[in-house]
């Protein structure tokens, strides 16, 4: 049998059954999530669930830039350090940079400090690049 690899929308990249779109526009976290959702197919800000997935994403983004942090789909909606993925994925894999999680920082970004392999918390109203993900 021939198994066809699903196709992603133009410009989105495919990895392990998912499509990813890297948006080089400035949005706060909630606006970024709304923009991801607008693409349908169950798209959300990206969940990153393994080191392999993190490495693939980091390598892709580093081909564009190495300085700007990028919103992902991890947030702390209750503001109690109870982090969860907006797409409902289980919060098992963690890659925090180790910086302080205090203050009014309840949304997660991929940090450029470690080539996008680690995450930092930031204020959700900051306008940043963002990464969307969906399963085709």
């Amino acid at each position: 049998d021939i198994i066809m690899r699903p196709s992603c929308a133009p410009g989105w990249f495919y990895h392990k059954s998912n499509c990813y779109g890297y948006f080089r526009k400035l949005r706060n976290w909630s606006d970024a999530e709304l923009e991801c959702q607008s693409y349908g197919n169950g798209a959300h800000l990206a969940s990153i669930l393994s080191l392999k997935e993190a490495s693939t994403i980091a390598e892709y983004i580093s081909g564009y830039q190495r300085s700007q942090p990028i919103w992902i789909g991890l947030h702390d909606p209750q503001k109690r350090q109870q982090w969860q993925w907006i797409d409902g994925a289980m919060y098992l894999y963690r890659s925090w940079s180790g910086k302080s999680m205090g203050g009014n920082k309840h949304c997660a970004e991929m940090s450029s400090n470690n080539n996008f392999l680690t995450w930092s918390s930031n204020e959700c109203n900051k306008r940043q690049h963002f990464l969307c993900k969906y399963r085709p």
Epitope: A9, G11, G21, R24, L26, Y64, Q65, R66, S67, H129
Partner: antibody, heavy 124, light 109 residues
Framework: EVQLLESGGGLVQPGGSLRLSCAAS????????MSWVRQAPGKGLEWVSA????????YYADSVKGRFTISRDNSKNTLYLQMNSLRAEDTAVYYC?????????????????WGRGTLVTVSS | FMLTQPHSVSESPGKTVTLSCTRS????????VQWYQQRPGSSPILVIF?????PSGVPDRFSGSIDSTSNSASLTISGLQSEDEGDYYC?????????FGGGTKLTVL
């Protein structure tokens, strides 16, 4: 009021050189990236080169790389384009434009102000 | 990649016209798109930035949008006026470079 005034255009033979200048006023010149955009007679717009506000980063279109050099003097609020090894296909009106701001592969801000342009004609 | 625009468009005064700008590869949605108006004999003027934002002084008859399905950006001008006649260029970013569309000549009949 933002003003950009280009000068230095003219007729030059193929293989020759020319230096364009752009005098800027009405904004804090050193805070903004600047660009050169050209338009061949009857044709569309073509981005040529850009430089960061500090002058530390420069960018070029493939068509001019190695022949053109962009620079700026923030003490004089002036942008320059040194054009060497000129070819007939470089004939165009050259516009000085404010913006966009690019760093490490990421660009923001549009070309929000343009000069009137200066005509460069490369012909024997 | 390239940005492709129709060579020319004509419409009557008072009508609405939509100019398109199609990206050949990569997603039109990933980077901001700008639109510039160039009246005959004049320098370009910014009319839309960041996909759909209007600079101060540009009338609200001008609006921009992005359609990811067709991978294109659009500039819509309503209540067309004779002074809208000219060339319109879309522009986006490619790494540290700037890419312009070939331009659309808008004629107000």
């Amino acid at each position: 009021e933002v003003q950009l005034l280009e000068s230095g255009g003219g007729l030059v033979q193929p293989g020759g050189s020319l230096r364009l200048s752009c005098a800027a006023s009405g904004f804090t010149f050193s805070s903004y990236a600047m660009s050169w955009v050209r338009q061949a007679p009857g044709k569309g717009l073509e981005w040529v080169s850009a430089i960061s506000g500090s002058g530390g980063s420069t960018y070029y279109a493939d068509s001019v790389k190695g022949r053109f050099t962009i620079s700026r003097d923030n003490s004089k609020n002036t942008l320059y384009l040194q054009m060497n090894s000129l070819r007939a296909e470089d004939t165009a009106v050259y516009y000085c434009a404010k913006g966009p701001d690019c760093t490490n592969g990421v660009c923001y801000l549009p070309f929000d102000y343009w000069g009137r342009g200066t005509l460069v004609t490369v012909s024997s | 990649f390239m940005l492709t625009q129709p060579h020319s468009v004509s419409e009557s005064p008072g009508k609405t016209v939509t100019l398109s700008c199609t990206r050949s590869s990569g997603s039109i949605s990933f980077d901001y798109v700008q639109w510039y108006q160039q009246r005959p004999g004049s320098s370009p003027i910014l009319v839309i930035f960041e996909d759909d934002q209007r600079p101060s002084g540009v009338p609200d008859r001008f609006s921009g949008s992005i359609d990811s399905t067709s991978n294109s950006a659009s500039l819509t001008i309503s209540g067309l006026q004779s002074e809208d006649e000219g060339d319109y260029y879309c522009q986006t970013y490619d790494d540290n470079r700037q890419v312009f569309g070939g331009g659309t000549k808008l004629t107000v009949l």
